[in-house]
């Protein structure tokens, strides 16, 4: 079986499908211990499909955001673009590279007064549970012919987390995306690593619930850092501020 692969801590995910969420700062989804490609998913083949089409920032990688490739380009065609470094112009947080956020139209460094925890986690954890649009930027979405009159329950197909009922997020499962429960305290979560090591997970976890963050489990008996599990843990003394 693939359990041995599933139980390993995956590193990063290629973006999932149109209209959905992936492992991007601010994402609804945490890459689960998943099936990685290349290197073990004997059930999957994947063609080279760069650039990656997208409808939301969440579909793109950690160092990318979703936008039209040309200024004033076709609104219906958006792809994942490289994030913007410090002091570059921006319209929303996701446009800025990890460790930065968008303030007054410019990517600026995230400091500990504004964001809690490690720089690597700050944007994901500060904005991951906030599904509202940041900086007044209205996101363009891809509408399906299926209208979601009621919010999706566990196992329902979704395009984005807002399609799911409270306590659930939209995460990849096999070749679809479904509503899965947001993680509770003590549950295993997946920390997003820096860009590179492009694995494709076909299983994703949700983010940690309200008041929780994904941190290394404090276990002094672990032999090495690389084998340490991340779990959802209560915030410590850091204050939590949203930027609007």
């Amino acid at each position: 079986t693939l359990n041995s692969v599933l139980n390993s801590n995956a590193i990063k995910n290629l973006p999932p499908p149109l209209g959905g969420a992936a492992g991007h700062p601010g994402s609804a989804v945490s890459a689960a211990p998943g099936i990685l490609y290349p290197g073990g998913n004997k059930y999957q083949t994947i063609d080279n499909y760069q650039p990656y089409p997208c409808a939301e920032d969440e579909e793109c990688g950690t160092d990318e955001y979703c936008a039209s490739p040309t200024r004033g380009g076709d609104a219906g065609v958006q792809i994942c673009l490289a994030c913007r470094k410090r002091r570059k112009r921006c319209m929303r947080h996701a446009m800025c590279c990890p460790g930065n956020y968008c303030k007054n139209g410019i990517c600026v460094s995230s400091d500990q007064n504004h964001f809690r925890g490690e720089i690597e986690e700050t944007i994901t954890e500060s904005f991951g549970n906030d599904h509202s649009t940041l900086d007044g930027y209205s996101r363009r979405t891809t509408l399906s012919s299926k209208m979601y009159h009621t919010k999706g329950q566990e196992g329902s197909v979704c395009l984005r987390s807002s399609d799911c009922a409270s306590g659930l997020c939209c995460a990849r499962h096999f070749w679809s995306k479904i509503c899965k429960p947001v993680l509770k305290e003590g549950q295993v979560c997946t920390k997003h690593r820096r860009k590179g090591s492009h694995g494709l997970e076909i299983f994703q976890r949700c983010y940690c619930g309200e008041g929780l963050s994904c941190r290394i489990q404090k276990d002094h008996h672990q032999a090495s850092n690389s084998s340490r599990l991340h779990t959802c843990q209560r915030h410590h003394h850091h204050h939590h501020h949203h930027h609007h």
């Epitope: 499908p17 299926k146 070749w175 429960p181």
Partner: antibody
Framework: EVQLVESGGGLVQPGGSLRLSCAAS????????ISWVRQAPGKGLEWVAS???????YYPDSVKGRFTISRDNAKNSLYLQMNSLRAEDTAVYYC???????????WGQGTTVTVSS | EIVLTQSPATLSLSPGERATLSCRAS??????????MNWYQQKPGQAPRLLIY???KQGSGIPARFSGSGSGTDFTLTISSLEPEDFAVYYC?????????FGGGTKVEIK
């Protein structure tokens, strides 16, 4: 109304090839995963291949390297190219999709493939 | 891969009776807080029809007499009162792990 209509089945000799089609309607085809599932005569169901809305493809070992799933979103069509066919590939082939939940919640009526000399 | 074993192979009952079908998985099909077990009904010459997903949730348009229960490795499909149109073959299927696999089926026949 969601509809999936398979076609392309028939009699083929061992080692031969066949291309199955599935015409979809009633939903935004490009947004959803779609799969092939088969059923040998008098037997149970077996997953054959899937393609996601983001175009990656999946196969079990039994058909990998011989079958290729593909989709044409402009034509709302799914295909299964079957090469190096064997007697054990004889089955009714269904296309199925997952529109409302992760299971195979909508199915076509199937097309019959017979591999025999 | 996860192997699903259904029992009994054949169930002989009369209309109005309660049918209880079992499906056992070779390993747990629970993950992410969901039991990834589904049930399908298939009549001769027809395509399968989804009855239950996530162990206990009803598919669209499925009558209330069909219900599912269980978690981990043991699952049950219950038909509270058999209607004439319910005599068919029933398959369980797991979606926890690739490849998705089906059980061998239980035939519910008229006694």
């Amino acid at each position: 109304e969601v509809q999936l209509v398979e076609s392309g089945g028939g009699l083929v000799q061992p080692g031969g090839s066949l291309r199955l089609s599935c015409a979809a309607s009633g939903f935004t085809f490009s947004s959803y995963a779609i799969s092939w599932v088969r059923q040998a005569p008098g037997k149970g169901l077996e997953w054959v291949a899937s393609v996601s809305g983001w175009l990656d493809t999946y196969y079990p070992d039994s058909v990998k390297g011989r079958f290729t799933i593909s989709r044409d979103n402009a034509k709302n069509s799914l295909y299964l190219q079957m090469n190096s066919l064997r007697a054990e590939d004889t089955a009714v082939y269904y296309c199925a999709t997952s529109l409302e939940n992760y299971a195979f919640d909508y199915w076509g009526q199937g097309t019959t493939v017979t591999v025999s000399s | 891969e996860i192997v699903l074993t259904q029992s009994p192979a054949t169930l002989s009952l009369s209309p109005g009776e309660r049918a209880t079908l079992s499906c056992r998985a070779s390993e747990s099909v629970d993950d992410f807080g969901i039991s990834f077990m589904n049930w399908y009904q298939q009549k001769p010459g027809q395509a399968p029809r989804l009855l239950i997903y996530a162990a206990s949730k009803q598919g669209s348009g499925i009558p209330a007499r069909f219900s599912g229960s269980g978690s981990g490795t043991d699952f049950t499909l219950t038909i509270s009162s058999l209607e004439p149109e319910d005599f068919a073959v029933y398959y369980c299927q797991q979606s926890k792990e690739v490849p998705p696999t089906f059980g061998g089926g239980t035939k519910v026949e008229i006694k």
